[in-house]
Amino acid sequence: NQDLPVIKCVLINHKNNDSSVGKSSSYPMVSESPEDLGCALRPQSSGTVYEAAAVEVDVSASITLQVLVDAPGNISCLWVFKHSSLNCQPHFDLQNRGVVSMVILKMTETQAGEYLLFIQSEATNYTILFTVSIRNTLLYTLRRPYFRKMENQDALVCISESVPEPIVEWVLCDSQGESCKEESPAVVKKEEKVLHELFGTDIRCCARNELGRECTRLFTIDLNQTPQTTLPQLFLKVGEPLWIRCKAVHVNHGFGLTWELENKALEEGNYFEMSTYSTNRTMIRILFAFVSSVARNDTGYYTCSSSKHPSQSALVTIVEKGFINATNSSEDYEIDQYEEFCFSVRFKAYPQIRCTWTFSRKSFPCEQKGLDNGYSISKFCNHKHQPGEYIFHAENDDAQFTKMFTLNIRRKPQVLAEASASQASCFSDGYPLPSWTWKKCSDKSPNCTEEITEGVWNRKANRKVFGQWVSSSTLNMSEAIKGFLVKCCAYNSLGTSCETILLNSPGPFPFIQDN
């Protein structure tokens, strides 16, 4: 049909970038390139109906459904979703194509369904059908990778039993400490399952799919390094594989390594050795201790010894169930308005936790850092000095943990006043919670020094705004003060703030703030 317009349907996926986390309005800023949805004419349908390819969206993802119309003249349009019509405002792009968009922010179950777009151009009318569903991630899993020895080869295979099939990569680093951070130039990534180069300083394997990324580090004892000041500890659950690598470098090949568990040499078949010469002609030896499926009796001190190095040990603890150990008592903090401060939680957990920080129903990303003593720490500094309740929540496959924090910001009270025909009220949010005084201004007391004590009702902390306490004081009006100016003052250790109210007839009252 010659009269039919050329139309294109596209899907734009928006990345909810972190700067918008915790902002309610945020139109997603960062977009990925549009995905063509085809938009084919639907056969055997009454009228002209185009059907876009089905769209599957992750929960909480933000998308735009967009139609580009190459037709002469103006167009008008209407979106219909679940029998409700939605506003539609076409505009024109640089190629003079009509552009119609439907933005869905933070996809939920209720936003899934059929979106119908009715377009009327000068030449013809037609309908475009989009079907939007939520991707079924209930069946998705992302499991922490584990290691296996490759049959008949000195190599490790990295396995992650996840759905959908994850991308597996080895993350290798040959320098010490901080320089082995993920984005450091010292870090090399290899997107493959098998690793032959097992002599590096730091070896991790990571698996990633739609659910995120999980990594496992190859636990290593380096006999050329001074031992940690605290005993290195490795936790595993019954049935998981155990891998410990012992590494030593010496000027020549004349040295050997051995593994012991509680003074007994490991059995044949539970270890294998590899050696190589490094660039400066020194000999590097590594000796792996491994158990394909650990039992409770594999718990104990594993000691790696050498004929040319001091021995070192690690404690392997086999648990039936994962755990999160931390103190869950709530903590209250009081800081100044410009004081630098971070909440922190120190915990020991296995398997590794997933965590969030929450304030005022908004979630913030949670970072965790391993400490030398086997503990990890998560800090939250992005409170922007907003008082209230902050919640740390952590979970792993077997355990959950929640800890509450209260942040109070020390500041001088700010007073707001309101009045009705029968009473005047003042509110303040300063901290520490303020005390109140009411004063009457009259000819006898032009400086408002005459204190009012009758009819005053103070309510401390009577309402919580995002966890922030507000204090109020109410003065019931009596004949003695009607028509006078009264002054309410809130004071705490940081200062005083007052508001003056004219007590006359109902209606708007002039308020004069004196600080």
Epitope: P227, L231, P232, G256, L257, T258, E262, N263, Y301, T303, S305, S306, S307, K308, H309, P310, S311, Q312, S313, A314, L315
Partner: nanobody
């Protein structure tokens, strides 16, 4: 849980001698896993001497011929015999055994 108890530190004149002992409790004892480290103020902890997996006493270059590590399996104790002490040997001396550290004993060598 292994407990390590060091003793024998003190103040000594240059050229003098001291013997440090380290007694282990709470674990089956094997002299092969003992080592001595030291930490001078503002410096990293460094290896001084150890007993290798084949029972040989090994000391590092800076103390060669002056320090000797030995042990007594019956007493669950390792020793560090220090002769010809120099001011640069001043440090806190720690013993290490099976992942655990002693609390340290101060050795001060005056010139």
């Amino acid at each position: 849980q292994v407990q390590l108890q060091e003793s024998g530190g003190g103040l000594v004149q240059a050229g003098g001698s001291l013997t440090l002992s380290c007694t282990a409790s709470g674990s089956t004892f094997s002299i092969n896993h003992f080592s001595w480290y030291r930490q001078a103020p503002g410096k990293q902890r460094e290896l001084v001497a150890f007993i290798s997996s084949d029972g040989v006493s090994i000391d590092v270059e800076s103390v060669k011929g002056r320090f000797t590590i030995s042990g007594d399996n019956d007493k669950n104790t390792a020793y560090l015999q220090m002769n010809g002490l120099k001011p640069e040997d001043t440090a806190v001396y720690y013993c290490y055994y099976r992942g655990f550290w002693g609390q340290g004993t101060q050795v001060t060598v005056s010139s």
